[in-house]
Interface confidence: low
């Protein structure tokens, strides 16, 4: 587990779990990389989900200086997506197929976020988002968008943990 005050997280464990997340995210929606939905309003909706950006301290120098900024950002994003995957968007109609990897993806997001949660310290996270798309087609569209952005998010997180495991592990 990570500990507050700049101590190292279990980089190797985080690396393994984030790589698993990448695999699950792509298997949850393998067509995402080959489709491009650009309907009206798409930009606004994709702004709603977390992105790891410049200034979040996830570059090699930022990780060396103080990895906590980046880890907190990743932790917040994991919690955000974990809540989305457990929301009505994914649990409502149309039902997911019984063998859908979304359940595993949901559990793995929670697992990695718990691995990052500092002992005896709770990074503040937001209240559960209020999500209530009324039509099944809206849910399908949101699932697509959420999984697409989740793929990008976990890909960056995996690179961060790979770098940490290679260069920052004790």
């Amino acid at each position: 587990r990570a500990v507050p005050g700049g101590s190292s997280p279990a980089w190797t464990q985080c690396q393994q779990l984030s790589q698993k997340l990448c695999t699950l995210a792509w298997s949850a929606h393998p067509l995402v990389g080959h489709m491009d939905l650009r309907e009206e309003g798409d930009e606004e909706t994709t702004n709603d989900v977390p992105h790891i950006q410049c200034g979040d301290g996830c570059d090699p120098q930022g990780l060396r200086d103080n990895s906590q900024f980046c880890l907190q950002r990743i932790h917040q994003g994991l919690i955000f997506y974990e809540k989305l995957l457990g929301s009505d968007i994914f649990t409502g109609e149309p039902s997911l197929l019984p063998d859908s990897p979304v359940g595993q993806l949901h559990a793995s997001l929670l697992g990695l976020s718990q691995l990052l949660q500092p002992e005896g310290h709770h990074w503040e996270t937001q209240q559960i988002p209020s999500l209530s798309p009324s039509q099944p087609w809206q849910r399908l569209l949101l699932r697509f968008k959420i999984l697409r952005s989740l793929q990008a998010f976990v890909a960056v997180a995996a690179r961060v943990f790979a770098h940490g495991a290679a260069t920052l592990s004790p």
Epitope: T45, D48, T125
Partner: nanobody
């Protein structure tokens, strides 16, 4: 530069309803997150509700959860605050605010300093 204009305030009986509107104009405003805040006489400004740019993420203050509903119509560049079951504790000047960047992460959305653009406010008075 973004301009925000609130409307819909007024005097209402306890238990009644009001719908506030916040119209945004200026630089492309439809994707702006929006927050509603209120300030009662002699009290600090208090967070009420937040809606992100596409309307996917919504937060409420505990004191209004279940009574107030925030929504948006991006075609009209307008955010709404539907207020039901109003009581005297809801009496305040209600202002909408927009940050330059979505505040979906962490704990920044209830903090007034996170917002860059503010409306003038609209008075809501609940009489008992």
């Amino acid at each position: 530069e973004v301009q925000l204009v609130e409307s819909g305030g007024g005097l209402v009986q306890a238990g009644g309803s009001l719908r506030l509107s916040c119209a945004a104009s200026g630089r492309t405003s439809s994707s702006y997150s929006m927050g509603w805040f209120r300030q009662a006489p002699g009290k600090e400004r208090e967070f009420v509700a937040y809606i992100s740019g596409g309307g996917l993420t919504i937060y409420y203050a505990h004191s209004v959860k279940g009574r107030f509903t925030i929504s948006r119509d991006n075609a009209k560049n307008t955010v709404y605050l539907q207020m039901n079951s109003l009581n005297s504790a809801d009496t305040a000047v209600y202002s909408c605010a927009a940050p330059k960047r979505d505040l979906y992460l962490g704990s920044r959305y209830p903090v007034p300093e996170s917002y860059d653009y503010w409306g003038q406010g609209t008075q809501v008075t609940v009489s008992s």
